[in-house]
Interface confidence: low
């Protein structure tokens, strides 16, 4: 079943390569377990950036080596992606799945274009 997912159109990463955005979904049911996946689309290639399954009211738990962190509040997920460089500029799509209880719902956002600008190197001082 389709579910509406909203996310910002554009986000600019910080000079430290950190980008944050909110992924909000219109939950048609009372889910107790939700899975959030961030996908990156660039040059028509889609790759999974990170994914987390969480219980409603609990923290998102990404894998230890994940570049993502996040928190949830109601039907909103606040996602932060770290370690970004200019080459990581692309469309980051939020995919939300209501895992339990049945029925299963799937929602895919339109994507957030994250722009990453590598910081200028500091000039050498005399």
């Amino acid at each position: 079943k389709a579910m509406h997912v909203a996310q910002p159109a554009v986000v600019l990463a910080s000079s430290r390569g950190i980008a944050s955005f909110v992924c909000e979904y219109a939950s048609p049911g009372k889910a107790t377990e939700v899975r959030v996946t961030v996908l990156r689309q660039a040059d028509s290639q889609v790759t999974e950036v990170c994914a987390a399954t969480y219980m409603m009211g609990n923290e998102l738990t990404f894998l230890d080596d994940s570049i993502c962190t996040g928190t949830s509040s109601g039907n909103q997920v606040n996602l932060t992606i770290q370690g970004l460089r200019a080459m990581d500029t692309g469309l980051y799509i939020c995919k939300v799945e209501l895992m339990y209880p049945p029925p299963y719902y799937l929602g895919i956002g339109n994507g957030t274009q994250i722009y990453v600008i590598d910081p200028e190197p500091c000039p050498d001082s005399d």
């Epitope: 219980m55 339990y100 209880p101 049945p102 029925p103």
Partner: antibody, heavy 118, light 108 residues
Framework: QVQLVQSGAEVKKPGSSVKVSCKAS????????IHWVRQAPGQGLEWIGQ???????YYNPSLKSRVTITADKSTSTAYMELSSLRSEDTAVYYC????????????WGQGTLVTVSS | DIQLTQSPSSLSASVGDRVTITCRAS???????LAWYQQKPGKAPKLLIY???TLQSGVPSRFSGSGSGTDFTLTISSLQPEDFATYYC?????????FGQGTKVEIK
């Protein structure tokens, strides 16, 4: 290829507990839920419960007070423990895989016969 | 809980026959959340059809599923010797997941 291999048959006394294992291979354990289903002799199928790779579990209310489902991700093994056994728990216990996005079971273990008898 | 009632409970048929099994739900179940399984004696069930009408990979095309709401049907267009088994419907729309009581297809 995808396989779910269960532990061997058990004979138990009423009031005791049984723990059945289900070792998964041929797929990424973390991408799926493992369910447990039982079938009493000559009877139909009864869903017991499930565990996600996250460790969260959900149970059939009819068995919730007596069943515990766990998983060891390091060995891709799921476990189902049923306590306070009674004769009506005599059944073949199956583990089965369902993918995210559905609860239809595309692969099943071979089954484990648990006999409860005094 | 959603109760699933299959009919008939058992049937006798010959090789080549067209066989129809019905599964009736106690409340409406969207097509997406209904599956059919085949089980042979001493074996685990095998997924035949999911989402009411989608054939699982590797399942012969003589099996088909249809229906919506509370009434679903499994049809075997031309019964083969290996099709003599028990068939179960399953709903996964509401928890707990439930199965029909089964329909045994026997050789006439």
């Amino acid at each position: 290829q995808v396989q779910l291999v269960q532990s061997g048959a058990e004979v138990k006394k009423p009031g005791s507990s049984v723990k059945v294992s289900c070792k998964a291979s041929g797929f990424t354990f973390s991408g799926y839920a493992i369910h447990w289903v039982r079938q009493a002799p000559g009877q139909g199928l009864e869903w017991i419960g499930q565990i996600y790779h996250s460790g969260s579990t959900y149970y059939n209310p009819s068995l919730k007070s007596r069943v515990t489902i766990t998983a060891d991700k390091s060995t891709s093994t799921a476990y189902m423990e049923l306590s306070s056994l009674r004769s009506e728990d005599t059944a073949v216990y199956y583990c089965a895989r369902s993918g995210y996005g559905g609860y239809d079971f595309d692969y099943w273990g071979q089954g484990t016969l648990v006999t409860v008898s005094s | 809980d959603i109760q699933l009632t299959q009919s008939p409970s058992s049937l006798s048929a010959s090789v080549g026959d067209r066989v129809t099994i019905t599964c009736r739900a106690s409340q409406s179940v969207p097509r997406r959340y209904l599956a059919w399984y085949q089980q042979k004696p001493g074996k685990a069930p095998k997924l035949l059809i999911y989402a009411a009408s989608t054939l699982q990979s590797g399942v012969p095309s003589r099996f088909s599923g249809s229906g919506s709401g509370t009434d679903f049907t499994l049809t075997i267009s031309s019964l083969q010797p290996e099709d003599f088994a028990t068939y179960y419907c399953q709903q996964y729309y509401r928890s707990p997941i439930t199965f029909g009581q089964g329909t045994k297809v026997e050789i006439k």
